[in-house]
């Protein structure tokens, strides 16, 4: 026969079958099915069929009236051509059909990886995507959803290049691989986590700094009086976006919103554009950019905000050691330590004391005093950009008594 | 006791700025925060926002946010409020207040300055 | 930051107690027990009367007292004296190291 090979196509672990088109009333006399090496089967009529292959053994049949061949559990190395030599009773020509088996793996779920992201001028990015499925080389074709204009694909539609502004939305993108056997999707993947710093560097009026207490509420300006006529305005800081679009409440990104770290504790005002934080937490310090967009989605301004966090101070602990008491003087070596203080605290004594010295996040003091005299009552406050605490020290008792010398 | 005195009486035109200076005399300046407060005639009292001076950190009013900015010379015991693009309801008594007790919090104002009028007119 | 709530004005007769509520919410008075009173003649700067709800500052006299329930802060002036007619104003700490003022109430001695 002339006719090009028929192609049939399989699944890794499945069944195919090689269809032959003999109709009941043909009368064979044989049927010799010759695989990718050698033959493979012999079959007759009313006889069974003889398999001489070891490998398809248990996975080879051929059905009783039109000697198609079937083959279970496929292996990728039963992939390729196939003859069936048709000798029919009283014939003495041999008919052939052949047969072409491709097999392939169902594939698995496409895995999308980020593989640049590049800022460009006018605060946009361009980000490149990269889908792949695993243990799957050949004959693999991808798509992505959605279809769009400043998105372009490459390498076969497994690169996915996608030039953004913070104000466009935020859109899912979902690569699908296929191949003759099957088709999968990735999970959605938003590509705004991958481009939060678009010009932020470069751009936009000069960084403000906001102080916060942890656990406490804060608001990050926009200062932007016309806030209710902005077509959308996006704050973003780490791999959130938060945006309020005009008539809308301001909403966190769905990938944020089931995030628990900013769950219902992010909002953007409606009234002022601000970025409003209830109960902050230590890891929402750092930069923070809003963008101001237009109608059209190109951003008109954009604005930076450092948050940094402080946690109000517990109450300090002051230790003390007896020095040496003699002379009638009594000398002692005061520590004042706040525990969970962090290295912005800072330690004054009062009344004054100008020997103190901090080192290690603690503050010491030398202190003497003649009996005669009277004890000094020292105050340790510890102060951090946010709060302060104190505590006195009484001292009245630490040498009392006649001729102590105690260490 | 420590006494803060304000700077005099300005007029400014829309549009400009203003720098309002506080000096602090007779305490530690630098372990207390400085509030600054406006009222405008006829109205209440506003919280514009306070510096920490042996911290240099500032905090604002939201309102205010972008359009102040509070500073603070240790060495000269002064703090400074200065407002810009400044609007005729921006004519207010702008007075500085500090906290005299070492509270667990800044920003108690205790002690109060005389007050600066500040008149915004073209 | 919106300002807390205050009566316009209250009056009272010498010897009498009045008390001047200051509402807010559970993001400043409610929230935190950081609360003050101040106390202004008029042409004068404001002069702190009560500080953390309810402690007095040296020199203030034991006539004026300051409380708290929920989101609703209060300052009680008994014993009226004419020198005490004058504006009151609450402020109360708003959480991050702001705070925010009452909208004033005049009180009047008749």
């Known amino acids: 026969k002339d006719s090009a090979p028929t192609v049939v196509s399989g699944i890794l672990g499945g069944s195919v079958t090689l269809p032959l088109n003999i109709s009941v009333d043909t009368e064979i006399e044989n049927v010799i099915w010759i695989g990718p090496k050698n033959a493979l089967a012999f079959a007759r009529p009313k006889e069974n069929v003889t398999i001489m292959v070891k490998s398809y053994l248990g996975r080879l049949d051929i059905t009783k009236w039109s000697y198609s061949l079937c083959i279970s559990n496929l292996t990728l190395n039963d992939a390729g051509s196939y003859k069936a030599q048709i000798n029919q009773r009283n014939f003495e020509v041999t008919t052939e059909e052949e047969f072409t088996l491709f097999v392939y793996e169902q594939l698995q779920e496409p895995q999308v990886t980020m593989k640049s992201v590049k800022v460009s001028e006018n605060f946009s990015c361009n980000i490149t995507l990269m889908c792949s499925v695993k243990g799957a080389e050949k004959s693999v074709l991808y798509s992505w959803t959605p279809r769009e204009p400043h998105a372009s694909e490459s390498n076969g539609g497994s690169i996915l290049t996608v030039s953004r502004t913070p104000c466009d939305p935020d859109l899912p993108y979902i690569c699908t691989a296929q191949n003759p056997v099957s088709q999968r999707s990735s999970l959605p993947v938003h590509v705004g986590q991958f481009c939060t710093d678009p010009g932020a560097s470069r751009g936009g009026t000069t960084g403000e700094t906001v102080v916060g207490v942890l656990g406490e509420p804060v608001t990050l300006p926009l200062a932007l009086p016309a806030c209710r006529d902005t077509e959308k305005v996006v704050w973003l800081f780490n791999t959130s976006i938060i945006s309020k679009e005009r008539e809308e409440a301001a909403t966190a990104d769905p990938l944020i919103k089931s995030r628990d770290p900013y769950k219902n504790r992010v909002w953007v005002s409606s009234q002022d554009c601000s970025l409003k934080i209830s109960q902050l937490k230590i890891e929402d310090a750092g930069p923070y950019h809003a963008y101001v967009c237009s109608e059209a989605s190109s951003v008109t301004s954009m604005t930076h905000v450092t948050l940094l966090i402080y946690r109000r101070l517990r109450k300090p602990k002051i230790t003390w050691s007896l020095r040496h008491s003699e002379d009638g003087i009594c000398r002692i070596s005061l520590t004042c330590s706040v525990e969970d203080g962090g290295n912005t605290v800072m330690y004054t004594w009062t009344p004054l004391q100008k020997e103190a010295v901090v080192s290690q996040g603690e503050s010491h003091l030398n202190v003497s005093w003649r009996s005669s005299e009277n004890h000094p009552n020292l105050t340790c406050t510890a102060s951090n950009p946010v709060s302060r605490s104190s505590h006195q020290f009484l001292s009245e008792n630490i040498c009392s008594g006649p001729e102590r010398n105690t260490k | 006791q420590m006494q803060l005195v304000e700077s005099g009486a300005e007029v400014k035109k829309p549009g400009s700025s203003v720098k309002v200076s506080c000096k602090a005399s007779?305490?530690?300046?630098?372990?207390?925060?400085i509030s600054w407060v406006r009222q405008a005639p006829g109205q209440g009292l506003e919280w514009m926002g306070g510096?920490?001076?042996?911290?240099?950190?500032?905090n604002y009013a939201q309102k205010f946010q972008g359009r102040v900015t509070i500073t603070a010379d240790k060495s000269t015991s002064t703090a400074y409020m200065e407002l810009s693009s400044l609007r005729s309801e921006d004519t207010a008594v702008y007075y500085c207040?500090?906290?005299?007790?070492?509270?667990?919090?800044?920003?108690?104002?205790?002690?109060w300055g005389q007050g600066t009028l500040v008149t915004v007119s073209s | 930051q919106s300002g807390l709530t205050q009566p316009r004005s209250v009056s009272g007769s010498p010897g009498q107690s009045v008390t001047i509520s200051c509402t807010g919410t559970?993001?400043?008075?409610?929230?935190?027990?950081?609360v003050s009173w101040y106390q202004q003649h008029p042409g004068k700067a404001p002069k702190l009367m009560i500080y953390?709800?309810?402690k007095r500052p040296s020199g203030v006299p034991d006539r004026f007292s300051g409380s708290k329930s929920g989101n609703t802060a209060s300052l009680t002036v008994s014993g009226l004296q004419a020198e005490d007619e004058a504006d009151y104003y609450c402020?109360?700490?708003?959480?991050?190291?702001?705070?925010?003022f009452g909208s004033g109430t005049k009180l009047t001695v008749l």
């Open positions: 559970s993001s400043d008075v409610g929230g935190y027990n950081y």
């Open positions: 510096i920490i001076p042996i911290f240099g950190t500032a």
């Open positions: 402020s109360s700490y708003a959480g991050s190291n702001t705070f925010v």
């Open positions: 953390d709800v309810s």
């Open positions: 007779g305490g530690t300046f630098s372990s207390y925060a």
């Open positions: 207040a500090a906290d005299m007790e070492l509270r667990d919090y800044y920003y108690g104002m205790d002690v």
